[in-house]
Interface confidence: low
């Protein structure tokens, strides 16, 4: 339904607090380098303007689109050319090209300083002195570092952030109360950001059809009692929500997400028996809860799939009449029967089924041609099962840190051109699949592991896209969304790679390593490991293990020494020489 003033419509729907928060997120995700104060000023100006439109929807400029209003506002930033370079050229364009231009300049790896957590007392004082500014700063800092963060979900994180400070700043031991909560929010936030980044990549790189297929599979697993028509309606609405958020239309996205949550809760009986608790919560918690809700129980006595999709004489007729609907039904029926499969596996099976029908429905005897199509699924199912089994065994044998190291070596040998920080970040995250998923029973391992790996490999893809250095990465990232993981799994050592020149500076360490947290120390060691493999890609596991053991002993020894810096200088030279000899550098 058309509104005279879109900005007034969204202001009234969302309320002032959410409106301001969402505009701040939108601006920070577009202009990631702008100071906080500049963004607050822009948001206040937009909010004042929105209020005039609420009072009189016919007022001047109130009929303009949100992209026009927000884009005009962003283009008033004085330092746009100096700070953002060619992004300033976006301002010469008209909508919708201007917004597309801003979207293309979003930076997944902005050159921003690491967020350092102040002392607890300092944070509590800041929180009490000006709660509103404190929380806005949180939104701003997260949004600019994660330009695709799911905006309505960030509001939920901010609500939890506020609750943590409200509770813990009054506690006897503030730090004991607050720090675990902040750690949890940080880790959950990173995971949420990465999951949303995959949704946006799916929409932007592979199109709406790819996203809808993903959504059909996932929602059918989650709501196996819902009818196909119901799942289709939810998929359509969910696609609209994510298209809007990924496109920077955060007000529309948040508004539509709230409508979707409302619809789901009003129609629980025909969707899922697991929604009751979620639907009793306030809006932000409700939406989050629905997004994370456990799979409902499968209906009893579901008939065999073969009847409708293999044995029926009407398979080709049904397929020809409405290809995507028929394939959607196949995916729905298969997914609701298989909560034990990953979404990407279900999509591979659907693709195989589609390919078979494309070929067979043009053959002389279609039925004979597609009669054995389900036999083709077996190897596709077994491949991830075997891979997960092997890797969980390796994880249980090695523990997380050493498992990450094994993956670091594996991936550095596959794609040694990729930057060391990216290889370390991605391999560490790949390695977390062990502690995240291997503890689950067989029936939950594959959806946990393979869908998580899809999220992590997407991080590699988006970081690599910014500075492409490897044709193999480009190929695996762009050929097929659902086959990214098998594509990377299939890569062997890159024989074309010319080993990196040895640089002793890379392996020079100082006493500051002793004061680092365990995590930071691990990252230092893993960075050295990647560099070692880049220098000596043919080094064996045994050689690398020996060097890394020596390195760990060297760090431990020098951190205990009285004169740490001298120890690092002298013992470091010996270690480099010994490592060179061991690896034949």
């Amino acid at each position: 339904d058309a509104h005279k003033s879109e900005v007034a419509h969204r202001f009234k729907d969302l309320g002032e607090e959410n409106f301001k928060a969402l505009v701040l997120i939108a601006f920070a995700q577009y202009l990631q380098q702008c100071p906080f104060e500049d963004h607050v000023k822009l948001v206040n100006e937009v909010t004042e303007f929105a209020k005039t439109c609420v009072a009189d929807e016919s007022a001047e400029n109130c009929d303009k689109s949100l992209h026009t209003l927000f884009g005009d506002k962003l283009c008033t930033v004085a330092t746009l050319r100096e700070t953002y370079g060619e992004m300033a050229d976006c301002c010469a364009k008209q909508e919708p090209e201007r917004n597309e231009c801003f979207l293309q300049h979003k930076d997944d790896n902005p050159n921003l300083p690491r967020l350092v957590r102040p002392e607890v007392d300092v944070m509590c004082t800041a929180f009490h002195d000006n709660e509103e500014t404190f929380l806005k700063k949180y939104l701003y800092e997260i949004a600019r570092r994660h330009p695709y963060f799911y905006a309505p979900e960030l509001l939920f994180f901010a609500k939890r952030y506020k609750a943590a400070f409200t509770e813990c700043c009054q506690a006897a031991d503030k730090a004991a109360c607050l720090l675990p909560k902040l750690d949890e929010l940080r880790d959950e936030g990173k995971a949420s950001s990465a999951k949303q980044r995959l949704k946006c990549a799916s929409l932007q790189k592979f199109g709406e059809r790819a996203f809808k297929a993903w959504a059909v599979a996932r929602l059918s697993q989650r709501f196996p009692k819902a009818e196909f028509a119901e799942v289709s309606k939810l998929v359509t609405d969910l696609t609209k929500v994510h298209t809007e958020c990924c496109h920077g239309d955060l007000l529309e996205c948040a508004d539509d997400r709230a409508d979707l949550a409302k619809y789901i809760c009003e129609n629980q009986d025909s969707i899922s028996s697991k929604l009751k608790e979620c639907c009793e919560k306030p809006l932000l918690e409700k939406s989050h809860c629905i997004a994370e809700v456990e799979n409902d129980e499968m209906p009893a006595d579901l008939p065999s799939l073969a009847a409708d999709f293999v044995e029926s004489k009407d398979v080709c007729k049904n397929y020809a009449e409405a290809k995507d609907v028929f394939l959607g039904m196949f995916l729905y029926e298969y997914a609701r029967r298989h909560p034990d499969y990953s979404v990407v596996l279900l999509l591979r099976l659907a693709k195989t089924y589609e390919t078979t029908l494309e070929k067979c429905c043009a053959a002389a005897d279609p039925h004979e041609c597609y009669a054995k199509v389900f036999d083709e699924f077996k190897p596709l199912v077994e491949e991830p099962q075997n891979l997960i089994k092997q890797n969980c065994e390796l994880f249980e044998q090695l523990g997380e840190y050493k498992f990450q190291n094994a993956l670091l070596v594996r991936y550095t040998k596959k794609v040694p051109q990729v930057s060391t920080p990216t290889l370390v970040e991605v391999s560490r995250n790949l390695g977390k699949v062990g502690s995240k998923c291997c503890k689950h029973p067989e029936a939950k391992r594959m959806p946990c592991a393979e869908d998580y790996l899809s999220v992590v490999l997407n991080q590699l893809c988006v970081l690599h896209e910014k500075t492409p250095v490897s044709d193999r990465v480009t190929k695996c990232c762009t050929e097929s969304l659902v086959n990214r993981r098998p594509c990377f799994s299939a890569l062997e050592v890159d024989e074309t790679y010319v080993p990196k020149e040895f640089n002793a500076e890379t392996f020079t360490f100082h006493a500051d390593i002793c004061t680092l947290s365990e995590k930071e120390r691990q990252i230092k060691k893993q960075t050295a490991l990647v560099e070692l493999v880049k220098h000596k890609p043919k080094a064996t596991k045994e050689q690398l293990k020996a060097v890394m053991d020596d390195f760990a002993a060297f760090v431990e020894k020098c951190c205990k020494a009285d004169d740490k810096e001298t120890c690092f200088a002298e013992e470091g030279k010996k270690l480099v020489a010994a490592s060179q000899a061991a690896l034949g550098l």
Epitope: T355, E358, D375, K378, P379, L380, E383, C487, A490
Partner: nanobody
Framework: EVQLLESGGGLVQPGGSLRLSCAAS????????IGWFRQAPGKEREGVSC????????NYADSVKGRFTISRDNSKNTVYLQMNSLRAEDTAVYYC????????????????WGQGTQVTVSS
């Protein structure tokens, strides 16, 4: 380096047989479907046969059904095309190509291509 290398082509009389091989280096074929294609002078490249990564699914162009057989030996990282009852119209350069997991319906769906091997059927 990722490479596919075809071999086994040559000159053969009508009714004769040849066995083409497609050997992969730089990656393992276990996760790849392999397609055989051919291109005769002045004609478009056309699909001949394909075998899915599992080996469980194969397909053939109508013109070669019953005469050609595709197979794979993952331990040797090689796929074979056995061509019997060869005809003059089978003369072409034969290429193998790899795609992750499944056969593709379009030529551009394949990730890696070999350089090709010439097959000539003539008396």
């Amino acid at each position: 380096e990722v490479q596919l290398l075809e071999s086994g082509g040559g000159l053969v009389q009508p009714g004769g047989s040849l066995r083409l091989s497609c050997a992969a280096s730089g990656f393992t074929l276990d996760y790849y479907a392999i397609g055989w294609f051919r291109q005769a002078p002045g004609k478009e490249r056309e699909g001949v046969s394909c075998i899915a990564s599992s080996g469980g699914s194969t397909n053939y162009a109508d013109s070669v059904k019953g005469r050609f057989t595709i197979s794979r030996d993952n331990s040797k990282n090689t796929v074979y095309l056995q061509m019997n009852s060869l005809r003059a119209e089978d003369t072409a350069v034969y290429y193998c190509a790899a795609a992750v997991l499944e056969c593709r319906t379009v030529v551009r769906g394949y990730d890696y291509w070999g350089q090709g091997t010439q097959v000539t059927v003539s008396s």
